[in-house]
């Protein structure tokens, strides 16, 4: 029987800069029941606080609700693992909520084949930003990426769309059924999951030349 091994806070995510959750990985348990507590302070403060909510994020997590979340202030946190034989502490983790946003996927993905008489045909893709993200305040800049492939192909073709919420693709294989998905990322932060796939049948008379 031994003191617990060193835990590690390995991930923090926020859906929208208003709340966030951090997760830790326990060290070895030392063969005894182990209690974990997360403590934190904000930069410039010395007062330590304990995690406000160990439940919402699931096992080995700490959730910071709206009243505990402030932007532009670095949180300095650590996890303490304790059993009957002793304690061990994780390394301190410095967290700025602005940098840990992982939004929901974009919404309302629409895909259409456009065949104008005077120009080359193209695939027109349009979507909306996720609802939790308030783009009007200017706090967020979302970047978008599109991926598509013929239904039976192994490789995805990826296009970076920048801040646009629509995109045109010219080079497609006629007669193929394509899968299309989109994802988004704040200027600082993490890519969302890919949106659910939308399928589009490219007409056989779709000409690329």
């Amino acid at each position: 029987q031994l003191p617990p091994g060193k835990p590690e806070i390995f991930k923090c995510r926020s859906p929208n800069k208003e709340t966030f959750t951090c997760w830790w990985r326990p060290g070895t348990d030392g063969g005894l029941p182990t209690n974990y507590s997360l403590t934190y302070h904000r930069e410039g403060e010395t007062l330590m606080h304990e995690c406000p909510d160990y439940i919402t994020g699931g096992p080995n997590s700490c959730h910071f609700g709206k009243q505990y979340t402030s932007m532009w202030r670095t949180y300095i946190m650590m996890v303490n693992a304790t059993n009957q034989m002793g304690s061990s502490f994780s390394d301190e983790l410095y967290v700025d909520v602005t940098y840990i946003v992982q939004p929901d996927p974009p919404l309302e993905l629409a895909v259409e084949v456009k065949q104008p008489e005077d120009r080359k045909p193209y695939l027109w893709i349009k979507w909306s930003p996720p609802t939790l993200i308030d783009l009007k305040t200017g706090w967020f800049t979302l970047l978008y990426e599109i991926r598509l492939k013929p239904e039976k192909a192994a490789e995805w073709e990826i296009h970076f769309a920048g801040q646009q919420t629509e995109f045109k693709i010219l080079s497609l294989h006629p007669g193929q059924k394509y899968l299309v998905q989109v994802r988004c990322k704040p200027d600082h932060g993490y890519w969302s999951a890919w949106s659910p796939a939308t399928f589009i049948q490219i007409p056989s008379d779709f000409t690329m030349n």
Epitope: E8, C12, R25, G44, L93, Y94, Y99, W191
Partner: antibody
Amino acid sequence: QVQLVQSGAEVKKPGSSVKVSCKASGYTFTTYWMHWVRQAPGQGLEWMGEIDPSDSYSNYNQKFKDRVTITADKSTSTAYMELSSLRSEDTAVYYCARNGGLGPAWFSYWGQGTLVTVSS
Amino acid sequence: EIVMTQSPATLSVSPGERATLSCKASQYVGTAVAWYQQKPGQAPRLLIYSASNRYTGIPARFSGSGSGTEFTLTISSLQSEDFAVYYCQQYSSYPWTFGGGTKVEIK
């Protein structure tokens, strides 16, 4: 404890490429951005670029944009910096540096440095 | 890009004395400034982040101040191990940039 161990010194010819590695240990590699900074002999520090090892998303200093490629291999917890079209001015010590936290780009852990000498 | 200008280039100080290093940014950077110490043949070591926050394990004799475009690193009472080169760095906008360094040498 956190360690960043870089590959050994290299001597390269002008026009060739060099690839420097940085093996991370003591923490979860995908948690923190990794940066590359260089220092010419007797000179100051110059940031080259950065990568998020969780998804290999990268940003570069425009000065190096066409010549530098930063990659990360999650399976071996190793970051790489490749610099092409080498010239004598690229002679420098190249450092990998780990982001200080989940936040802005200040660097709390540094590799030991790799000296790259470009000479004909 | 934002240019970080450090002064003086060299500072001669006696052990036990106070050292004041200056760093000026060419544009507003808020408090997005870090300070590093580098000794010959070694990698830089982080001292201060967010202009005034001491990093874990850094002695209290190191302090940072300033915001906007003017920043200061103060070493209240120089110890023998503090003689080194000091760099400021801004992380307000890409590309992240460093000052040219101030060498603190023994007087």
